[in-house]
């Protein structure tokens, strides 16, 4: 689609005669017809297949055109076209003298034709003007012609349309040969991709507008590059959404089971070194002089009763020191300097002559020890108790005072952590070296399937073409993301050609 | 059930201060980047400031920047913003929002907000 311009600029008939040579009374009020059509060899008469326009009365005999209009007419005179312009044309220009001011065809003799002139040629578009004279016995037109294409038509035949537009089905200006030029932040074939935020991730971030960058379900930060984990995950991360990896030291399904109790909490003291056992669960081992679960306690250097026959032990700085009782001497009180006759036996001991009287023995009833029956038998010696369990005694017996979990005379048994029933909402619980776990029916989720949970969206495979299914946990809904050359919700459409633009 | 409970708001002079508060629930707030929003009076929502997951990422509007902080204790599901040198301008309904896209200069849509704390800054 285009205009063919014409612009008439003089025409020059001196002596104010017709065709035929007849003067025009009293002058020749001169208009003019145009005819465009397609190009002909030889110019002939016929119907003006280009189109057809005419003037009002410009001027008498002799005149100029100005610019513009006069007289109600248009000039440049305008021959719009709706076709693909050919390269090639036929222009018929005739004067004509207007007796009256009825100027149609049928309303004016035939002999009030001043001159006539036709010529072919080919004419690309352009905006440049091509400046023509024609000359006849009588008379000269001084005129120039050219082709420009109507508003949103490019192209050297003006068959290209391109209409700048910023809306859903496009973001663009037209270049000079038709071609878009996309507005800034926008890009693809019809300048309808808007350019994301720099540097949003290409898979897990997507935009509607330049220069955002969207988050797809499991992803967050400013370009959509870091994945959320698992909801509930305590101490570990993530490298794909949903994940829940354990940090050095944690375990269990969202890694709030303590594995390394030693680095986390330090329970030993006094210098002891902490070895774990399993989860929540330590061994501390004490530095000489310490005692207790943690080493909390410290040993007195008399509590392992050094001194013996009734001898009475005083703890000093550097040690201790053993006060003997009447008949025993030396550093624990080990040597007697008595013999039967003395009663030296303690606590219903029998006493047994050696060595023909020098020296003796006694025989200790049940609960008594020592040279002189003078102990009461510490039944923890032997660290009878398991699992880190405490040793107490009493009176004729001893007992153990167990840690959290274990029970028992020795504190040998390991508590069932699933007899209290501890899963919720039907889930199975299975007992561990150290704790428990359950397995949760579906629907449900959690140390102890406390948490209901919505079954995965994307279970159902609801997108099409191989596209990435997301379950968005906070919705319990699917997100597609579609590889390229589909959309829809479930990526269920091909991208087609661009739908027709109703310009 | 994801909930945020923003408290702290109130009255307040020019040039002086408040610590806003926002309890979170339902979801695991240290696995998520946080942000301030806030709306005046017959005006869009404005973002103000957003901190990233674990803290040691923050960002501020060109409006508040050197005058509020961002800031949060993921042990106690809390997110914070202490406002210094108030001024007029910065009465609104102040959020806390999960934000879930970003724009050139911060974030610009949330998936979560809560019911907003009103701040007033008057003589």
């Known amino acids: 689609s285009g205009v063919f311009q014409l612009q008439l600029q003089e025409f020059i008939n001196e002596r104010g005669v017709l065709a035929s040579g007849r003067p025009c009374e009293p002058g020749c009020r001169t208009f003019f017809r145009v005819c465009l059509k397609h190009f002909q060899a030889v110019v002939s008469p016929g119907p003006c297949t280009f189109g057809t326009v005419s003037t009002p009365v410009l001027g008498t005999n002799s005149f100029a055109v100005r610019d513009d209009s006069s007289g109600g007419g248009r000039n440049p005179l305008q021959l719009p076209f709706n076709f693909t312009w050919p390269g090639t044309f036929s222009l018929i220009i005739e004067a004509w003298h207007a007796p009256g001011d009825d100027l149609r065809p049928e309303a004016l003799p035939p002999d009030a034709l001043i001159s006539k002139i036709a010529i072919q040629g080919s004419l690309a578009v352009g905006q440049n003007w091509l400046l023509d004279e024609q000359t006849s016995t009588l008379t000269r037109l001084r005129y120039s012609y050219r082709v420009i294409c109507s508003d949103n038509y490019y192209g050297d035949n003006c068959s290209r349309l391109c209409k700048k537009r910023n809306d859903h089905f496009g973001h663009y200006v037209c270049q000079p040969d038709g071609n878009l030029s996309c507005l800034p932040g926008w890009t693809g074939e019809y300048c309808q991709q808007p350019i994301c935020l720099s540097g949003c991730h290409e898979q897990n971030g997507y935009c509607s507008k330049p220069a955002e960058c969207l988050c797809r379900p499991g992803w967050q930060g400013r370009l959509c590059n870091e994945c959320i984990p698992h909801n509930g995950c305590r101490h570990g991360t993530c490298s794909t959404p949903w994940q829940c990896t354990c940090d050095e030291g944690w375990g269990g399904l969202f890694c709030d089971q303590d594995l390394n109790y030693c680095t986390h909490h330090s329970p030993c003291k006094n210098g002891a070194t902490c070895s774990n056992s399993g989860q929540r669960s330590y061994t501390c081992t004490c530095r000489p002089g310490y005692t207790g679960v943690d080493c909390e306690l410290e040993l007195s250097e008399c509590d392992s009763n050094p001194c013996r026959n009734g001898g009475s032990c005083k703890d000093q700085e550097d040690g201790y020191h053993c006060l003997c009782p009447p008949g025993y001497y030396g550093l624990h009180c080990e040597h007697s300097t008595l013999s039967c006759a003395d009663s030296p036996c303690f606590n219903g001991g029998s006493c047994r002559e050696r060595n023909q009287g020098a020296n003796y023995a006694c025989e200790c009833p049940p609960n008594f020890t020592g040279s002189n029956c003078e102990k009461k038998v510490d039944r923890c010696t032997s660290n009878p108790c398991a699992n880190g369990g405490q040793c107490l005694n009493r009176g004729p017996s001893r007992m153990c005072r167990c840690r959290p979990g274990f029970t028992g005379t020795y504190c040998e048994l390991h508590v069932s952590d699933c007899a209290r029933n501890p899963c919720a909402h039907g889930g199975t619980c299975h007992d561990l070296e150290n704790g428990l776990m359950c397995t949760c029916p579906a629907g449900f989720s959690g140390r102890r399937c406390e948490v209901r949970t919505s079954i995965d969206a994307c279970a159902s495979s609801p997108c099409f073409n191989r596209a990435t299914c997301y379950t968005d946990l906070s919705t319990d809904t699917f997100v597609c993301n579609c590889p390229y050359g589909f959309v829809g919700s479930r990526c269920e459409f091909p991208v087609g050609l661009p739908p027709s633009f109703p310009w | 059930e994801v909930q945020l409970v923003e408290s702290g708001g109130g009255l307040v002079q020019p040039g002086g201060s408040l610590r806003l508060s926002c309890a979170a629930s339902?979801?695991?707030?240290?696995?998520?980047?946080m942000s301030w929003v806030r709306q005046a009076p017959g005006k869009g929502p404005e973002w103000v400031s957003a901190i990233n997951s674990g803290g040691g990422t923050t960002y501020y509007a060109d409006s508040v920047k050197g005058r509020f902080t961002i800031s949060r204790d993921n042990a106690k599901n809390t997110l914070f913003l202490q406002m210094n040198s108030l001024k007029p301008e910065d009465t609104a309904v102040y959020y806390c929002?999960?934000?879930?896209?970003?724009?050139?200069?911060?974030?610009?849509?949330?998936?979560?907000w809560g019911q907003g704390t009103q701040v007033t800054v008057s003589s």
């Open positions: 339902g979801f695991t707030f240290g696995s998520y980047d």
């Open positions: 929002a999960i934000p879930r896209g970003w724009g050139p200069t911060g974030p610009l849509e949330y998936g979560y």
